[in-house]
């Protein structure tokens, strides 16, 4: 690597993937081992942001970019730049403090994350309910009772809808 | 409950092997990193080592890189670590504990146990 | 390796009080920042992880904030099982932790 010439601030000439290493006259150096630059002129480089435990690695890091993560099978980015992992729980289930739970009746949740939320209430859009809700799925709500032909019958519909059970913190 | 106890721990001359244990229990050992952690006499909190699920992934802080070993037993839900070429330096508590496989964070502990290196 | 610099290293203070101690990274670490708390002799507790998250059992008297390179843990009100040694630590790279702070009685 060159020795910079600029006239205003030597460093400004070195590229990306190097830093301007003042204890050998402000050459250009390349970034060490496990560390990066993404922009030019820099007097240091970033370490490498290291992808273990619940993180693996999506992008291997490089003199001139950061490693990215994101978390092995089984968990979930959650938060800027995936600063944390989540369990998965099935559909069907929440997360609580103590591990994955069933959906209470009346509640569903068709991910493998978030909360169980209540089944849609038909009645207040003035619909019926054409297909049962279940602890995977929301219920399908159909014409109201009154678009019905005489002789049809719906589906009698689901008890109130509660809030989701969440274990004490 | 969770539970990380301690063993293994006492006086070494310089140069001298130690071999550390942990025993783990209230949880599923094989779904969780461990790690050794050590604090010197009066000092702060110092990353020394951690090891993946299985075992087959291991690091290491760089001083004591190729005289410390990270290794686990999972059928036995036991965490170890081997050290050779003690120095005085190493003396201090050695904590094991659980990586919460959330976001880098510790959250459970063992009691510690105080290796010391000394003639 | 990331260096993690605490402030103050120790402090005086009373029941009720509101404390708060900076933890500053030697490069930004995002949000892979936890707390720690440590009495004499025992091993530490995690009181927060990932700058902000209030570990399952901590009274809600603690909290943290911050992100990238700069990080406080406040205690609200000072209670008496709160004296202690508290540490900050970077899970973004090879683990490092700060120095300590030792809250004391005034």
């Known amino acids: 690597f060159e020795r910079t010439r600029s006239l205003q601030d030597p460093c400004s000439n070195c590229p990306a993937g190097t830093f301007c290493d003042n204890n050998r006259n402000q050459i250009c150096s390349p970034c060490p081992p496990n560390s990066f630059s993404s922009a030019g002129g820099q007097r240091t480089c970033d370490i490498c942001r290291q992808c273990k435990g619940v993180f693996r690695t999506r992008k291997e890091c490089s003199s001139t970019s950061n490693a990215e993560c994101d978390c092995t099978p089984g968990f979930h980015c959650l938060g800027a730049g995936c600063s944390m992992c989540e369990q998965d729980c099935k559909q069907g289930q929440e997360l609580t403090k103590k591990g994955c739970k069933d959906c209470c009746f009346g509640t569903f949740n068709d991910q493998k994350r978030g909360i169980c939320r209540p089944w849609t209430n038909c009645s207040l859009d003035g619909k019926s309910v054409l297909v049962n809700g279940t602890k995977e799925r929301d219920v399908v709500c159909g014409p109201s009772p009154a678009d019905l032909s005489p002789g049809a019958s719906s589906v009698t519909p689901p008890a109130p809808a509660r809030e989701p059970g969440h274990s004490p913190q | 409950q969770v539970q990380l106890v301690q063993s293994g721990g006492g006086l070494v001359q310089p140069g001298g092997s130690l071999r550390l244990s942990c025993a783990a229990s209230?949880?599923?050992?094989?779904?969780?990193?461990m790690d050794w952690v050590r604090q010197a006499p009066g000092k702060g909190l110092e990353w020394v080592a951690d090891?993946?699920?299985?075992?087959?992934?291991?690091y290491y802080v760089d001083s004591v890189k190729g005289r410390f070993t990270i290794s686990r037993d999972n059928a036995g839900n036991s965490l170890y670590l081997q050290m050779n070429s003690l120095r005085a330096e190493d003396t201090a508590v050695y904590y094991c504990?659980?990586?919460?496989?959330?976001?880098?964070?510790?959250?459970?502990w063992g009691q510690g146990t105080l290796v010391t290196v000394s003639s | 390796a990331i260096q993690m610099t605490q402030s103050p290293s120790s402090l005086s203070a009373s029941v009720g009080d509101r404390v708060t101690i900076t933890c500053r990274a030697s490069?930004?670490?995002?949000?892979?920042l936890n707390w720690y708390q440590q009495k004499p002799g025992k091993a530490p507790k995690l009181l927060i992880y990932?700058?902000?998250s209030l570990q399952s059992g901590v009274p809600s008297r603690f909290s943290g904030s911050g992100s990238g390179t700069d990080f406080t843990l406040t205690i609200s009100s000072l209670q008496p099982e709160d004296f202690a040694t508290y540490y900050c630590?970077?899970?973004?790279?090879?683990?490092?932790f700060g120095q300590g702070t030792k809250v004391e009685i005034k």
């Open positions: 504990a659980r990586d919460a496989m959330r976001g880098g964070d510790l959250d459970y």
């Open positions: 209230g949880f599923t050992f094989t779904n969780f990193w």
């Open positions: 090891i993946n699920k299985d075992g087959g992934e291991k």
């Open positions: 490069q930004s670490i995002s949000s892979y």
């Open positions: 990932a700058a902000s």
């Open positions: 630590q970077q899970s973004y790279s090879t683990p490092t």
